[in-house]
Amino acid sequence: EVEKTACPSGKKAPEIDESLIFYKKWELEACVDAALLATQMDRVNAIPFTYEQLDVLKHKLDELYPQGYPESVIQHLGYLFLKMSPEDIRKWNVTSLETLKALLEVNKGHEMSPQVATLIDRFVKGRGQLDKDTLDTLTAFYPGYLCSLSPEELSSVPPSSIWAVRPQDLDTCDPRQLDVLYPKARLAFQNMNGSEYFVKIQSFLGGAPTEDLKALSQQNVSMDLATFMKLRTDAVLPLTVAEVQKLLGPHVEGLKAEERHRPVRDWILRQRQDDLDTLGLGLQGGIPNGYLVLDLSMQEALS
């Protein structure tokens, strides 16, 4: 905290300008009027205040707005945002996407800080849902944003927002998150034709059930191995050799290189060796000929 001292004669700031950078911290405290600062916040970012001087400016705003800053001030915080704590931000009511963008710009190129996480949380909660424009903005600044949300939080994403999602935005999502996002994507893209639909849905397929994979296998989609390897193991296991062959198309040859990795390894163990041999890839580990396969889960269901 800066001590209260009288402003030296002739140093009272008539406006917020660059002459203030040469003021000592106590002079800034004594000679800059908080109300003037609030009305001229748009100038602050263009002035090369030091990080220490920004402390004083923050202190002045805190005194002026003990219940939290108005959006007119928040919008122009610029580098002052770096001085805010999550506790400060929880007092704010940010409704404008432009304000959000302006503050995210300050943190650009850095990992998501607790301040940014709190800001986003406040903004999204205020909006009630993660709409397309917000998601567009957030994933532009933080490609991993979507995958940082819990499945519960993702459930509030409307299907219309899925159009804003790029493949790289899903890179770090786990199966539980894709389980939530996939049905939304399916709904969002349902009116697209086959090949266009596959291009859009491809990055969400880690959440697809068996019946959807079976349906895709009938559409000559030629799924690449990278996508196939991200599918849910439980969704892949019931697929027949013929269905996998149709699903992968020319990429089926890549199964050989992945035969020791999930889900390929587990899928191989469920197939008849005879059927695997028809692929001509030398895949080993299938069920030997003459063995009877009992589906115990089916038996339990019948009893």
Epitope: I21, P48, F49, T50, Y51, E52, Y79
Partner: antibody, heavy 119, light 107 residues
Framework: QVQLQQPGAELVKPGASVKLSCKAS????????MHWVKQRPGQGLEWIGM????????NYNEKFKSKATLTVDKSSSTAYMQLSSLTSEDSAVYYC????????????WGTGTTVTVSS | DIVMTQSQKFMSTTVGDRVSITCKAS??????VAWYQQKPGQSPKLLIY???NRYTGVPDRFTGSGSGTDFTLTISNMQSEDLADYFC?????????FGAGTKLELK
């Protein structure tokens, strides 16, 4: 990558002026302040001042106010510093440097220009 | 103006040593201090910023510490390529000021 290119050396006569250049590449020139720093042989570094290429706004160390004039040419992404009324005290290496805002430490330095004032 | 004092102009060292270079500010600068390394004929290179944060690509044998008026740059395992001049800089207030430098030499 981010680079600040400066001419290697300038030989000037006492009383004359010299205009040093600093050509920026690898980043958006108009988005960063450009600072200038002086280093005399075997001595420390002295901050001269800074200019914002977008606005042309300048701020000087009081000590160099009557010695240095900072300008920019946005079209060529080049910053300039004119030094006037040169004396042997001005013989030094001059660096341009890009700061990290709002912390004002320098993550990118120019290659430096050695100014020699001699008759 | 804030004066940054590096009391040792020269320091003798050997490879493998732990070396501590000090810098004292004439008034409180918080943690607004950076450290630079400069080799002969080269530009300064940023090592440490905000008193203790290592800049990208700087080996972890370099560490910075301190706040207020007293700051230290430590090289935990001196290497021959670390022989250079080291400068501190404060960015708490204008004008920005630097220390006079400490030159590391071989014993």
């Amino acid at each position: 990558q981010v680079q600040l290119q400066q001419p290697g050396a300038e030989l000037v006569k006492p009383g004359a002026s010299v205009k040093l250049s600093c050509k920026a590449s690898g980043y958006t020139f108009t988005s960063y302040w450009m600072h200038w720093v002086k280093q005399r042989p075997g001595q420390g570094l002295e901050w001269i001042g800074m200019i914002h290429p977008n606005s042309g706004s300048t701020n000087y160390n009081e000590k160099f106010k009557s010695k240095a004039t900072l300008t920019v040419d946005k079209s060529s992404s080049t910053a300039y510093m004119q030094l006037s009324s040169l004396t042997s005290e001005d013989s030094a290496v001059y660096y341009c440097a890009r700061p990290v805002v709002p912390y004002w430490y320098f993550d990118v330095w120019g290659t430096g220009t050695t100014v020699t004032v001699s008759s | 103006d804030i004066v940054m004092t590096q009391s040792q102009k020269f320091m003798s060292t050997t490879v493998g040593d732990r070396v501590s270079i000090t810098c004292k500010a004439s008034q409180n600068v918080g943690t607004a201090v950076a450290w630079y390394q400069q080799k002969p004929g080269q530009s300064p290179k940023l090592l440490i910023y905000s008193a203790s944060n290592r800049y990208t690509g700087v080996p972890d044998r370099f560490t910075g510490s301190g706040s207020g008026t007293d700051f230290t740059l430590t090289i935990s395992n001196m290497q021959s390529e670390d022989l250079a001049d080291y400068f501190c800089q404060q960015s708490s207030s204008y004008p920005l000021t630097f220390g006079a430098g400490t030159k590391l030499e071989l014993k």
